[in-house]
Amino acid sequence: SGTTNTVAAYNLTWKSTNFKTILEWEPKPVNQVYTVQISTKSGDWKSKCFYTTDTECDLTDEIVKDVKQTYLARVFSYPAGNVESTGSAGEPLYENSPEFTPYLETNLGQPTIQSFEQVGTKVNVTVEDERTLVRRNNTFLSLRDVFGKDLIYTLYYWKSSSSGKKTAKTNTNEFLIDVDKGENYCFSVQAVIPSRTVNRKSTDSPVECMGQEKGEFREI
């Protein structure tokens, strides 16, 4: 059903990284506008992005209220300039999104190595604890706050003169690794949620190498 001059949205897709969550869809509107609604499985529908000509809607504010809930969205199509018009069944045309559970599905953003410090044959590598848009008591939570021990980091490290990458893992944001004295090392980290079956890993952080600005060397 629907009015003769509107088409239903299609290819509804969730795009989410570190809980910043946008619903995208097609087609680009021609003589029509869209409104999005979102709800949890048991909740009421809430309207967002009223009568927009965009083909995306930022739903972050809604999903961060409870990132472990499962959400459903729908996109309504209305004729441009006649948004009260309804389809033959008395309702505007709409299409449902796939279900989306932020805690299980949001992509992990690219991590950043905050610092590294060498003390003798040990190097301490610290990963930046990225802030998310999830709030508790009016403060924004970090990725570690949200995921706790579910989130681990894998460190890849290698001698500047070699290609083989050793690995280390931590469920904090710090690594303490053994290195050979007098050798320069490079580092890259990856965020991982091992309990997931999809979207388990982030892209790798930019590579940081000893002898560059971020690090500090102390001879003991």
Epitope: I152, K165, T167, K169, V192, P194, S195, T197, K201
Partner: antibody, heavy 120, light 107 residues
Framework: EVQLVESGGGLVQPGGSLRLSCAAS????????IHWVRQAPGKGLEWVGY????????YYADSVKGRFTISADTSKNTAYLQMNSLRAEDTAVYYC?????????????WGQGTLVTVSS | DIQMTQSPSSLSASVGDRVTITCRAS??????VAWYQQKPGKAPKLLIY???FLYSGVPSRFSGSRSGTDFTLTISSLQPEDFATYYC?????????FGQGTKVEIK
Amino acid sequence: EVQLVESGGGLVQPGGSLRLSCAASGFTISDYIIHWVRQAPGKGLEWVGYIDPSNGYTYYADSVKGRFTISADTSKNTAYLQMNSLRAEDTAVYYCARDPQSLTSPFDYWGQGTLVTVSS
Amino acid sequence: DIQMTQSPSSLSASVGDRVTITCRASQDVNTAVAWYQQKPGKAPKLLIYSASFLYSGVPSRFSGSRSGTDFTLTISSLQPEDFATYYCQQHYTTPPTFGQGTKVEIK
């Protein structure tokens, strides 16, 4: 169902080459790390090397460094072990195994293995 | 590289016996030790991870423990299907390393 299937084993002369494949199903290899482990006849398990298919990073055991190369084709969901300059002591059953990359991260799934025999 | 020294290399036991296999790491590996069971002509199967956690589907007669750098696999009451070779493995650092294996045979 998670499955790893190795293929490509066989008889090869010393100094020869062979490429083993590890075809994965039931999961996406780029979400995990893939290891190769070998077992000489009547002997124990020896780790050969790993690849992280998401970035191509690898590391090898000293015994195969410079001779073996691990690669992955994420579009085929398959990892490979290219073995060059083969020696009699490389004769073994070769297994690929999945590493869930958790803190406790052992190898949770293994293939059935493929036998490589290096002999003249 | 971290060495995993496993003992004994073989043992004979009867059905119903309590069996203990030990592995000593050459340096600290925290709890990053796994135990595998392997039967002839088959791939290894994961039994215990993180030193003491039973992998899904593994019978509760298998257990693991840690004391410092010493790790123990215990089979509380040996069953006919438990005759196999057992390996410990550390995955704390690269490269991961295996113990030499313990063959459990029928007495």
